[in-house]
Interface confidence: low
């Protein structure tokens, strides 16, 4: 049986059940290389409390559909005398990066995971030429996730003192110049994740090969190498390579750009101070507030919730968007879709789409940007579920009793973007981390 998602085959992936202190290793095409789980384990569970290993999915006992992968075992879980076997179930959804498997829950018999990934899309529009896992768990099993930094088009310009060259990078995947053929990037070779531009020429100085690594709790490293033979004439016989070190700052701060810290014989060392390198719980919340010791800030958007069936309305030319954030109030137009953001076509109001659901909510504060994300909406033709990204700005003189109103700013590949000026986005900092 062919591997259902070849893009995900090259790596052993990790997921964590934080509540129970369990680390899962997942290899969806072969087996994980962990002796204690046996030679054919595709899903290996490491219980750190009891220091034991269990195979909870066998690579030989795999069954697959387009959106679901199940690994059975021969181990009975013996629930009330039934003949059930321990198994793992991975539900795949279309995403814009390779993404990460997320642990959902475990019953007595079944370990459930969800994975939003380009590999599960019906169309190839988000697929990279080369992409590597872009997250890592530290020794305390806290997740550091750089997926939000991945550019689907264009690249980051590295801060460099050399006026004759420009170094462009992407994070964990190659630079897509087809979708965004910026004048300087247009000459970059396909597959490069680090592109050196000199005059009218562009050179591949690194492609992603291995996934993100953690070197210390707050330092992550990504290495790019130039795969093919054939040395560049300005590299003095050396093969080009790029090392990017992502550093979690010691306290809350605005975002910075990547900086070149060393360069020798086409070996480029880049340091990027960004809060995305910090553990995810420092940046994100599933509720509409971020506060407490862990986050160093106090943010509470819950006063923006609308009651009594009313919604915020944002005009998007062909569409009207109805928003009801930070609550579970049904939007009247949205046909019981549990939508936080509802898209209605002006010319045909029967065409209604959920552009993100209220139980699929993430509040993120990173590098000075406050963002509320709603995902899991109605599918587009690519298979990607519509989502909405609301970027908040602090405005102490906002109208509507300080609440302000959301403004639609555009759509890219079924992701809808809004800005929202409100006094409730004014962040209070606690200065200790």
């Amino acid at each position: 049986q062919a591997a259902p998602f070849p893009e995900l085959c090259s790596y052993t992936w990790e997921a964590v059940d934080t509540k129970n202190n369990v680390l899962y290793k997942i290899n969806i095409c072969g087996s994980v290389d962990i002796v204690q789980c046996g030679p054919s384990s595709a899903v290996c569970m490491h219980d750190l409390k009891t220091r034991t290993y269990h195979s909870v999915g066998d690579s030989v006992l795999r069954s697959a559909t387009r959106s679901l992968l199940e690994f059975n075992t021969t181990v009975s879980c013996d629930q009330q005398g039934t003949n059930h076997r321990v198994q793992s179930s991975i539900a795949f959804l279309c995403g814009k990066t390779l993404g990460t498997p997320e642990f959902v829950t475990a019953t007595f018999c079944v370990h459930y995971f969800e994975w939003r990934t380009t590999a599960a899309c019906k169309k190839d529009i988000f697929k990279a030429n080369k992409e590597v896992p872009c997250y890592v768990f530290d020794e305390e099993l806290r997740k550091h996730d750089l997926n939000p930094l991945i550019k689907l088009s264009g690249a980051y310009l590295v801060d460099d003192s050399d006026p004759d060259t420009s170094l462009f990078i992407n994070v964990c995947r190659d630079i897509d110049t087809l979708r965004d053929p910026g004048s300087q990037l247009r000459a970059c070779p396909p597959g490069t994740a680090a592109c050196l531009v000199r005059g009218h020429q562009a050179f591949d100085v690194g492609q992603p090969r291995d996934g993100l690594k953690v070197v210390r709790k707050d330092r992550l490293v990504l290495s790019y190498v130039r795969e093919e033979a054939g040395k560049l004439d300005f590299c003095d016989g050396h093969s080009p390579a790029v090392t990017i070190t992502f550093v979690c700052p010691s306290e809350r701060r605005e975002g910075t750009i990547p900086k070149l810290t060393a360069k020798s014989n086409c070996r480029y060392e880049i340091e990027w101070i960004t809060e995305y390198a910090c553990h995810r719980d420092y940046l994100e919340s599933k509720t509409c507030s971020l506060s407490g010791e862990q986050q160093d800030v106090s943010i509470d958007l819950t006063p923006l919730a609308q009651s009594g069936g009313s919604s915020y309305i944002s005009d998007g030319k062909e569409y009207l968007f109805y928003l009801n954030v930070c609550g579970e109030t049904e939007i009247q137009f949205c046909n019981k879709k549990q939508a936080a953001v509802c898209q209605v076509k002006k010319s045909d109001t029967s065409q209604v789409k959920a552009a993100g659901r209220y139980h699929n909510q993430t509040l993120r504060y990173s590098d000075g940007d406050l963002t509320l994300i709603y995902f899991g909406g109605d599918e587009c033709s690519s298979g990607f579920q519509r989502m909405s990204v609301i970027n908040f700005e602090c405005n102490k003189t906002a109208g509507n009793d300080g609440k302000g109103t959301p403004v639609f700013t555009g759509e890219v590949d079924c992701t809808y973007f809004f800005t929202w000026d409100t006094e409730y986005a004014c962040v209070h900092h606690h200065h200790h981390h």
Epitope: K122, K123, D124, I125, K127, N129, L178, P190, S382, G383
Partner: nanobody, 116 residues
Framework: QVQLQESGGGLVQPGGSLRLSCAAS????????MDWYRQAPGKQREWVAT???????TYADSVKGRFTISRDNTKNTVYLRMNSLKPEDTAVYYC??????????WGQGTQVTVSS
């Protein structure tokens, strides 16, 4: 009726070359992602190469630099050019179309044998 038909397999000496073809009928060919897989005797089917609908190509490490995937939309055909063939490349080669609308479509396969 939707169909894929592979051809071009055969017996070749180590170091030799072959070009496999996969002709599609009944589908809008350019909308599909095309994959080549292979299955050696007694082994699981393994992925070889992919040509995305917008033109990008990816290869398994074992064939990188030796195999090239390409397509001709006017002929509704995808090709796999195989150079520097090795005995371990011996397998039945299958092509697959991944459509945004239909289920995945597989061809019947073509035998490639690399032997002196």
């Amino acid at each position: 009726q939707v169909q894929l038909q592979e051809s071009g397999g055969g017996l070749v000496q180590p170091g030799g070359s072959l070009r496999l073809s996969c002709a599609a009928s009944g589908i809008i060919f350019s909308d599909n992602r095309m994959d080549w897989y292979r299955q050696a005797p007694g082994k699981q089917r393994e992925w070889v190469a992919t040509l995305a609908s917008y033109g990008w190509k990816t290869y398994a490490d074992s064939v990188k630099g030796r195999f090239t995937i390409s397509r001709d939309n006017t002929k509704n055909t995808v090709y796999l050019r195989m150079n520097s063939l090795k005995p371990e490349d011996t397998a039945v080669y299958y092509c697959k179309a991944s459509s945004p609308v239909l289920n995945d479509i597989w061809g019947q396969g073509t035998q490639v044998t690399v032997s002196s």
